[in-house]
């Protein structure tokens, strides 16, 4: 089948890194500079992605694969393929529409990206709190209270003054 197909369509013989050049009697021509084709049988080569500004090059473009970008220090990638760079915040903060804001009591963020999240409720998984949470760290859950040996005690975090939430986004 493949042989039959290639007789019918000469372009199917063109490997990755080339394109089927209609202007040259459908022969396989190498992709021009700053372009690539990642699969065979392509009639055009795709333009290489350019990592400019807040983007920096993680992997150079080759004739068979696109460039890959990441973000300069102080920023992190968002979206598949790092389609956007977003400002970092500190741990214990989240990025809102008004800039970086500290996590509210009862919430934490252990990364430089993302949101402040409520501390894990250990009791929902039948466990107890071994270590209290902070703005930067979730609580650490341990064995269930029934599993603790006599005399051992677990640390119970102070009850939040209100339902754990986070600063406005």
């Amino acid at each position: 089948f493949e042989r039959t197909r290639s007789l019918q369509d000469p372009c199917s013989n063109c490997p990755a890194g080339t394109f089927c050049d209609n202007n040259r009697n459908q022969i396989c021509s190498p992709c021009p500079p700053n372009s690539f084709s990642s699969a065979g049988g392509q009639r055009t080569c795709d333009i290489c992605r350019q990592c400019k500004g807040v983007f920096r090059t993680r992997k150079e473009c080759s004739s068979t694969s696109n460039a890959e970008c990441d973000c300069t220090p102080g920023f992190h990638c968002l979206g598949a393929g790092c389609s956007m760079c977003e400002q970092d915040c500190k741990q214990g903060q989240e990025l809102t529409k008004k800039g970086c804001k500290d996590c509210c009591f009862g919430t934490f963020n252990d990364q430089k990206r993302g949101i402040c999240r409520p501390w894990t409720n250990c009791s929902l998984d039948g466990k107890s709190v071994l270590v209290n949470g902070t703005k930067e760290r979730d609580v650490v859950c341990g064995p269930s209270p029934a599993d603790l040996s006599p005399g051992a005690s677990s640390v119970t975090p102070p009850a939040p003054a209100r339902e754990p939430g986070h600063s406005p986004q």
Epitope: H76, C77, L78, G79, A80, E86, E94, L95, T96, K97, T107, D110, Q111, R113, G114, I115, R117, P118, W119, T120, L124, D125, D138, V139, C141, E163, P164, G165, H166, P168, Q169
Partner: antibody
Framework: QMQLVQSGAEVKKPGASVKVSCKAS????????MHWVRQAPGQGLEWMGW????????NYAQKFQGRVTITRDTSASTAYMELSSLRSEDTAVYYC?????????????WGQATLVTVSS | SYELTQPPSVSVAPGKTARITCGGN??????VHWYQQKPGQAPVLVIY???DRPSGIPERFSGSNSGNTATLTISRVEAGDEADYYC?????????FGGGTQLTVL
């Protein structure tokens, strides 16, 4: 390429439990929160909860607290969702979804779905 | 708990512009994400953080968010855009979805 592959369809009796798996590939499993979302036939999307694969920390929707348990096996890059005390209303398609990290929790990669049917 | 309200259905002729709204109290202060779901398929993120497009999503898809309404706009609508669309936000420890809008291309 990022991919989430879920376990196959399940048929359960009322009162039983079901455990659905979600195997991640193509990215650092521990670096991104994993969520579970379900969709009853002909209905909308309903969020169930998340897990932080790095720490194992969880957060569940109030509706499912006490019935759902989300766990992970980092060595296998796999998250699990177990739902207990099943009833007919739990018949739904269940999805795992990776959080992309944008402000306000975006779900940028979804599993292919697992159909759970609860019937006596 | 926070609620998001979407119209159940929106109809549009091919080539025209479709607008799908998502209402919520002071939703403009939140980050809104939009998903497209075709029959028998998993949802796909089409807009995140109000107006940003993931790679691979056509420029015809755009979003805005202010006051009490977020809007997904699809310009030059094609038959392949026919699907259910869901808005979603994060609110005080919960992920919240709108009820969904069925987009019909006439």
């Amino acid at each position: 390429q990022m991919q989430l592959v879920q376990s196959g369809a399940e048929v359960k009796k009322p009162g039983a439990s079901v455990k659905v798996s979600c195997k991640a590939s193509g990215y650092n499993f521990s670096g991104y929160y994993m969520h579970w979302v379900r969709q009853a036939p002909g209905q909308g999307l309903e969020w169930m909860g998340w897990i932080n694969p790095k720490s194992g920390g969880t957060n569940y929707a109030q509706k499912f607290q006490g019935r759902v348990t989300i766990t992970r096996d980092t060595s296998a890059s796999t998250a699990y969702m177990e739902l207990s005390s099943l009833r007919s209303e739990d018949t739904a398609v269940y999805y795992c979804a990776r959080e992309g990290g944008a402000r306000g929790v975006d779900l940028d990669t979804w599993g292919q779905a697992t159909l759970v049917t609860v019937s006596s | 708990s926070y609620e998001l309200t979407q119209p159940p259905s929106v109809s549009v002729a091919p080539g025209k512009t479709a607008r799908i709204t998502c209402g919520g109290n002071n939703i403009g202060s939140k980050s809104v994400h939009w998903y497209q779901q075709k029959p028998g398929q998993a949802p796909v993120l089409v807009i995140y953080y109000d107006s940003d497009r993931p790679s691979g999503i056509p420029e015809r898809f755009s979003g805005s968010n202010s006051g009490n309404t977020a809007t997904l706009t699809i310009s030059r609508v094609e038959a392949g855009d026919e699907a259910d669309y869901y808005c979603q936000v994060w609110d005080s420890s919960s992920v919240v979805f709108g009820g969904g809008t069925q987009l019909t291309v006439l």
